[in-house]
């Protein structure tokens, strides 16, 4: 599985390195963390236990999405 990979970037265009996920059952993982009044920070990569999740906090919001097709 080929996934885009990055750590704590503010732009999707800075998340275009490609990582080869070699473990059985891995998925592509994207986390978007938005702090109130600030930019959204994006992280992507391979994840063995990815679960779609969305949480609202007093200071912002965290959104995790999982997918399992190449470059999804």
């Amino acid at each position: 599985l080929l996934c885009y990979s990055c750590k704590a970037q503010v732009s999707n265009e800075d998340c275009l390195q490609v990582e080869n996920c070699t473990q059985l059952g891995e998925q592509c993982w994207t986390a978007r963390i938005r702090a109130v009044g600030l930019l959204t920070v994006i992280s992507k990569g391979c994840s063995l236990n990815c679960v779609d999740d969305s949480q609202d906090y007093y200071v912002g919001k965290k959104n995790i999405t999982c997918c399992d097709t190449d470059l999804c």
Epitope: L2, Y4, N12, E13, L16, V18, D52, T65, C66, C67, D68, T69, D70, L71, C72
Partner: antibody
């Protein structure tokens, strides 16, 4: 309405070069990843190139890698395919296509241009 | 690469007939399969995505089914306007690949 219009095809000699263009209209071009797909004279469909929304990442099948270059100009809503070292087996109708997502993982080519013909002979 | 084997390569049927096309993949692709229709001189058109989802504006006589490596595309009652070549395509793994096509003709 949503439309893709290719141009730039023609007759070229083996080893020659050609640059195809595709103008998009009716949608926010910069929000979509795009691809080129070709239909060979044997009526086979082959995916030939992919480009990310902003143009920062491209991908090609091994048969194409190093010979074709996909690029885009989001300010002009235009997709390009620069083809070099052309071979007779590159003879085909070339289509510009939009990639649309269904959910997080699944996608499909939902919009196609009318195509532009490339003959290498 | 994932090989897509479509059968038959061509078929001839009468108006009103039920037509079935199969697509077999060399690896498990879950439900990540699309079907396209291409009429002579025209661009391909999306009919079905994610194995069984009908694209908007596509008549309900078209349907899809399957999972894993075996998929089926059906026209429940063939109409004259259905004369075309039909292709399956997998969107799971790069390079993205298409079946060889099935040419449908009217008897």
């Amino acid at each position: 309405q949503v439309k893709l219009q290719e141009s730039g095809g023609g007759l070229v000699q083996p080893g020659g070069s050609l640059k195809l263009s595709c103008v998009a209209s009716g949608f926010t071009f910069s929000s979509y990843t795009m691809s080129w797909v070709r239909r060979t004279p044997e009526k086979r469909l082959e995916w030939v190139a992919y480009i990310h929304n902003g143009g920062g990442h491209t991908y090609y099948p091994d048969t194409i890698k190093g010979r074709f270059t996909i690029s885009r100009d989001n300010a002009k809503n235009t997709l390009f395919l620069e083809m070099s070292s052309l071979k007779s087996e590159d003879t085909a109708m070339y289509y510009c296509t939009r990639r649309m997502y269904y959910g997080n993982s699944h996608w499909y080519f939902d919009v196609w241009g009318a195509g532009t013909s490339v003959t290498v002979s | 690469d994932i090989q897509m084997t479509q059968s038959p390569s061509s078929l001839s049927a009468s108006v009103g007939d039920r037509v079935t096309i199969t697509c077999r993949t060399s690896q498990d692709i879950s439900n990540y399969l699309n079907w396209y229709q291409q009429k002579p001189g025209k661009a391909p058109k999306l009919l079905i995505y994610y194995t069984l989802k009908l694209n908007s504006g596509v008549p309900s006589r078209f349907s899809g089914s399957g999972s894993g490596t075996d998929f089926t595309f059906t026209i429940s009652s063939l109409q004259p306007e259905d004369i075309a070549t039909y292709y399956c395509q997998q969107s799971k793994t790069l390079p993205w690949t298409f079946g060889g096509g099935t040419k449908v003709e009217i008897k």
